[in-house]
């Protein structure tokens, strides 16, 4: 019986977790789009070589996105990216990592 084999519960748990991660990943993408490209008053995040730490209010959509990011990273990574001045890292669908929430002007 498929449920009787050793490790199958673990497999189910893993696939369930993966499904949840995929769902959250999609949610994060939606939030990204909602916050950026559709709004002239909002810039899309741009990865830059210099990060600046600034105090900004955490509310609304940012709070929601922070929760999604935390769930995506847990339990293997720390809650904050230490010393980066960013409130999180964005993991895209091919698993590369880019800065989120820490853009400043790129100087020439």
């Amino acid at each position: 019986h498929p449920l009787g084999s050793p490790g199958s519960a673990s497999d189910l748990e893993t696939s369930g977790l993966q499904e949840q991660r995929n769902h959250l990943q999609g949610k994060l993408s939606e939030l990204q789009v909602e916050q950026t490209s559709l709004e002239p008053l909002q810039d899309s995040p741009r990865p830059t070589g210099v990060w600046k730490s600034r105090e900004v209010a955490t509310e609304g959509i940012r709070g929601h996105r922070k929760m999604v990011l935390y769930t995506l990273r847990a339990p293997r990574s720390p809650k904050m990216v230490q010393g980066s001045g960013c409130f999180g890292r964005k993991m895209d669908r091919i698993s590369s990592s880019s800065g989120l929430g820490c853009k400043v002007l790129r100087r020439h």
Partner: antibody, heavy 124, light 111 residues
Framework: QVRMQELGPSLVKPSQTLSLTCTVS????????VGWVRQAPGKALEWLGI???????GYNPALKTRLSITRDTSKNQVSLSLSSVTTEDTAVYYC??????????????????WGPGRMVTVSS | QAVLTQPSSVSRSPGQSVSITCSGS?????????VGWFQQVPGSAPKLLIY???SRASGVPDRFSGSRAGNTATLTITSLQAEDEADYYC???????????FGSGTRLTVL
Amino acid sequence: QVRMQELGPSLVKPSQTLSLTCTVSGFSVTNSGVGWVRQAPGKALEWLGIINNDGVAGYNPALKTRLSITRDTSKNQVSLSLSSVTTEDTAVYYCGTRDLPSDVRYGNMYINYWGPGRMVTVSS
Amino acid sequence: QAVLTQPSSVSRSPGQSVSITCSGSSSNVGYGNYVGWFQQVPGSAPKLLIYSATSRASGVPDRFSGSRAGNTATLTITSLQAEDEADYYCVSYDSSSKFGVFGSGTRLTVL
């Protein structure tokens, strides 16, 4: 260092098109949005429009039909075009950008780098 | 006519405090902490003081602070100095137009 300057004619005839260019140095217009604001003599500040770092433009609803904002990324410039001008369009025209974290919601409203402004008079 | 209402003028003596209000509606000021404040000395470009309702822009003294409650945003300046004499404008996101709106402006005179 971020520098911005509004360039264009200081005198425009009624019914003509007012065209200004915002020249930018110290940052790329693909990294930060550029906004336009004007101020008629003795009056309050007024939003004209904004083009974000993706090239998406937004306009003051009251001016939307007459206004166009475009950018030239190769020249790192943003241009404003206001058609069918009247004497009511006489004002100092400013362009500006912001240097704030990208997660600041509606951050392009918060301009903290400004050009010196260009006084444009509409008169025949 | 500006959508956001500010007192046209206020005056105070040096060392005193002043609060400048910016009244709007549920579609702008009341929509969230998407409010900013600019200072403008006549003849010069505006200067950003406050963004996101309460955050001070870089280099702005802590004598300047912002708050928002309901449909009203407030800029408070403590320990007034002569150089604070200027025009002050609020700005807010407006959800109905999906664009920004400025307040009518307040002339602050330091006596």
